[in-house]
């Protein structure tokens, strides 16, 4: 059984969250993909989406969010630059497949943004300078507004819950690790 894990990323204000979601290449390569925030007890809210059909490794920038869909690798890269404390929350990638319900991808991201600068060296930038060298592109296709009731979520359950998906059996498990993502000076 595949486990739908939740990874916790602890970052400082101004840093960049740089994550990836993988998908079944053969099924979803050109499907439209989205980055959503899940607020407790609310419907997931779409913050950014790729074009429809999704273009290969073509960066789409919506405010401080940059999406890059690597069709040939079955990976959606998501960057959230210049993070703010209010960006803290639970995020997920989904694939839009109308008229069917959105397909949730691995993994969910629990983002915790705190004030102050972390001097720890590492893989996430505290400056957005380089990120904006990407030619800014806005989505030509609007992100669909519908969201499946099945994806309405509260905070991850204390006990393991089974969630069925079209592809595989998924166990929703509690957070086991915190990824403290370091920054570049």
């Amino acid at each position: 059984a595949t486990k739908l894990t939740e990874e916790k990323y602890e970052l400082k204000e101004g840093q960049t969250l740089d994550v990836k979601c993988d998908y079944t290449l053969e099924k979803f390569a050109s499907s439209q993909k989205a980055w959503q925030i899940i607020r407790d007890g609310e419907m997931p809210k779409t913050l950014a989406c790729t074009e429809r059909p999704s273009k290969n490794s073509h960066p789409v920038q919506v405010g401080r969010i940059i999406l890059e869909d690597y069709h040939d690798h079955g990976l959606l890269r998501v960057r959230m630059v210049n993070l703010q404390v209010e960006d803290s929350g639970l995020y997920q990638c989904v694939i839009y497949q109308p008229p069917k319900e959105p397909h949730m991808l691995f993994d969910r991201i629990r983002l915790v943004v705190t004030k102050g600068f972390s001097g720890t060296p590492g893989s996430n930038e505290n400056s957005t300078q380089n990120v904006y060298k990407i030619p800014p592109t806005t989505t030509k296709a609007l992100c669909p507004l519908y969201t499946s009731p099945r994806t309405v979520t509260q905070a991850p359950p204390k006990s393991t819950a089974d969630v069925s998906t079209p592809d595989s059996e998924i166990n929703l498990t509690n957070v086991t690790d915190i990824i403290r993502v370091p920054v570049f000076n």
Partner: antibody, heavy 122, light 107 residues
Framework: QVQLVQSGAEVKKPGASVKVSCKAS????????INWVRQATGQGLEWMGW????????GSVQKFRGRVTMTRDTSIHIAYMELSSLRSEDTAVYYC???????????????WGRGTLVTVSS | DIQMTQSPSSLSASVGDRVTITCQAS??????LNWYQQKPGKAPNLLIY???NLETGVPSRFSGSGSGTAFTFTISSLQPEDIATYYC?????????FGQGTRLEIK
């Protein structure tokens, strides 16, 4: 002990397929990507592709697309890389390497298998 | 694809020498660069990640610097056990590519 243990050397004929295994131990297998890198004798390192052991999804570079299949068996913590339609240029040492967390865009390889020599010869 | 060009392709130095290897990226890769050491007949070993961060357990004589397109790998005082080939690797986008390697020998 945190390690990746690969299967033994193989000799194959052109047109055949080879399946290399990589057994992970000492860490949570499904939490980190597995990557495959090959190295022809006296040559540099060539990244072939990746696999998420949790979802089973994988991707490979254009050069190998259609010829390479990456799979896993989570119950025994083994990743597999199968390369088909072998040709003499595929003669190389094939390495499995652990990547970053499955959700992270951090493609560094901090744990490597010892490599599997695949010789393609008629 | 991003091309990674290492120089020199080989070098010879004496024990105690300061050794520098450079890696040039064909486009801006920010700090998405790693350095590996590969001893003859062995698998590569991660030394530096994200351009400048020393991997756990790696001696402090190894260091890395740079960002954008120009990167440097330094051994502050060469030791006999440092005889190996060194590779840079980027991950700014896909596909991941390695430099062609720098072979280091002792004089």
């Amino acid at each position: 002990q945190v390690q990746l243990v690969q299967s033994g050397a193989e000799v194959k004929k052109p047109g055949a397929s080879v399946k290399v295994s990589c057994k992970a131990s000492g860490y949570t297998f499904t939490r980190y990507d597995i990557n495959w890198v090959r190295q022809a004798t006296g040559q540099g390192l060539e990244w072939m592709g990746w696999m998420n052991p949790n979802s089973g999804n994988s991707g490979s570079v254009q050069k190998f697309r259609g010829r390479v299949t990456m799979t896993r068996d989570t119950s025994i913590h083994i990743a597999y890389m199968e390369l088909s339609s072998l040709r003499s240029e595929d003669t190389a040492v094939y390495y499995c390497a652990r990547g970053g967390y499955t959700s992270s865009w951090r493609w560094y390889f901090d744990l490597w298998g010892r490599g599997t020599l695949v010789t393609v010869s008629s | 694809d991003i091309q990674m060009t290492q120089s020199p392709s080989s070098l010879s130095a004496s024990v105690g020498d300061r050794v520098t290897i450079t890696c040039q990226a064909s486009q801006d890769i920010r700090k998405h660069l790693n350095w590996y050491q590969q001893k003859p007949g062995k698998a590569p070993n991660l030394l530096i990640y994200d351009a400048a961060n020393l991997e756990t357990g790696v001696p402090s004589r190894f260091s890395g610097s740079g960002s954008g397109t120009a990167f440097t790998f330094t051994i502050s005082s060469l030791q006999p056990e440092d005889i190996a080939t060194y590779y840079c690797q980027h991950y700014a986008n896909l596909p991941i590519t390695f430099g062609q390697g720098t072979r280091l020998e002792i004089k």
